[in-house]
């Protein structure tokens, strides 16, 4: 039975040209996290493996930085970065937990951070 929950930064917005931290946190389980994948739609952005550490996909390595923690920092944001991002926690014995973040990249300076919310 999967008892854990993933808390994410939720729906967030940021200014074009700026940077943003995508953060997920797995709680309410002592399952061993073997790997966390960060994906945008169907594209793999980065992997954080418990033994091997971070791997950033070559096509994103100029704009994506690992951390803080198991989070991911996106830099030099463009309007094309708007969309859904997923943190995928591979664990045992529980299995896979997925968190969703929606990022909106704005042209103006009215970007505000959304509230945190939980995904069961």
């Amino acid at each position: 039975m999967m008892t854990g929950t993933i808390e994410t930064t939720g729906n967030i917005s940021a200014e074009k040209g700026g940077s943003i931290i995508l953060q997920c946190h797995l709680s309410s389980t002592t399952a061993q996290v073997t790997q966390v994948n960060w994906e945008q739609q169907d594209q793999l952005l980065a992997i954080c493996n418990a033994d091997l550490g971070w791997h950033i996909s070559p096509s994103f390595k100029d704009r994506v930085a690992p951390g803080p923690g198991l989070g991911l920092t996106l830099q030099s944001l463009t309007v094309n970065d708007t969309g859904e991002y997923f943190c995928i926690y591979h664990t045992y014995p529980d299995g896979t937990y997925t968190g969703r973040i929606f990022l909106e990249v704005l042209e103006s300076s009215v970007a505000e951070h959304g509230a945190r919310f939980q995904i069961p």
């Epitope: 039975m1 946190h25 389980t29 061993q32 418990a50 033994d51 014995p93």
Partner: antibody, heavy 118, light 112 residues
Framework: EVQLVESGGGLVQPGGSLRLSCAAS????????MSWVRQAPGKGLELVAE????????YYPDTVKGRFTISRDNSKNTLYLQMNSLRAEDTAVYYC???????????WGQGTLVTVSS | DIVMTQSPLSLPVTPGEPASISCRSS???????????LEWYLQKPGQSPKLLIY???NRFSGVPDRFSGSGSGTDFTLKISRVEAEDVGVYYC?????????FGGGTKVEIK
């Protein structure tokens, strides 16, 4: 090489307290769930506590719930077990253990003996 | 709670001969993920336990191939194809498919 070294065991009176430590090296400590397993003299193995990699989640069986507290300091690569209200039946060798490769206790320390007696 | 029952309690063995230990769970230990998290440990006299087998049949690093694990659902077996003197000790099965995670009571293997 993965190394787990327990310390802090000793003789304590019933009702007393003790804090065990487990110093970890040879791996990224902050990436792993960690556990304490005990073995009473001449008896089998019993899981007594486990803690998630971040320290945010813990698990205890009913036999120790409310008396034992597992914690960790990822900056010091150290796992702890605070044992309060100790009873004679808590007398055991206490091992810390780490998962790996899809196994729950892939690596074990050498153990530290806790004796609860008046 | 899932009870893990091992048999026999004691197993006298002859070096070079095969040996088999049974572990039965009180209910299925197939996890929702489809994996069966059943492990075998050997604790030699005066030592810490050591992992032999994980996920029913996978040998851990450095474990000799004379050790093998099998089974499914509730019935599991550890086999030693040819017992060696260094294999003496207490063997434990363990499940962590379900909380609370539980050990079997142990099987003591000794040379005849």
């Amino acid at each position: 090489e993965v190394q787990l070294v327990e310390s802090g065991g000793g003789l304590v009176q019933p009702g007393g307290s003790l804090r065990l430590s487990c110093a970890a090296s040879g791996f990224t400590f902050s990436s792993y769930t960690m556990s304490w397993v005990r073995q009473a003299p001449g008896k089998g193995l019993e899981l007594v506590a486990e803690i998630s990699s971040s320290g945010g989640s813990t698990y205890y069986p009913d036999t120790v719930k409310g008396r034992f507290t597992i914690s960790r300091d990822n900056s010091k690569n150290t796992l702890y077990l605070q044992m309060n209200s100790l009873r004679a039946e808590d007398t055991a060798v206490y091992y810390c253990a780490r998962p790996g490769l899809g196994a729950w206790f892939a690596y074990w320390g050498q153990g530290t003996l806790v004796t609860v007696s008046s | 709670d899932i009870v893990m029952t091992q048999s026999p309690l004691s197993l006298p063995v002859t070096p070079g001969e095969p040996a088999s230990i049974s572990c039965r769970s009180s209910q299925s230990i197939v996890h929702n993920s489809g994996n069966t998290y059943l492990e075998w440990y050997l604790q030699k006299p005066g030592q810490s336990p050591k992992l032999l087998i994980y996920k029913v049949s996978n040998r851990f690093s450095g474990v000799p191939d004379r050790f093998s694990g099998s089974g499914s659902g509730t019935d599991f077996t550890l086999k030693i194809s040819r017992v060696e003197a260094e294999d003496v000790g207490v063997y434990y099965c363990f499940q962590f498919s379900h909380v609370p995670r539980t050990f079997g009571g142990g099987t003591k293997v000794e040379i005849k």
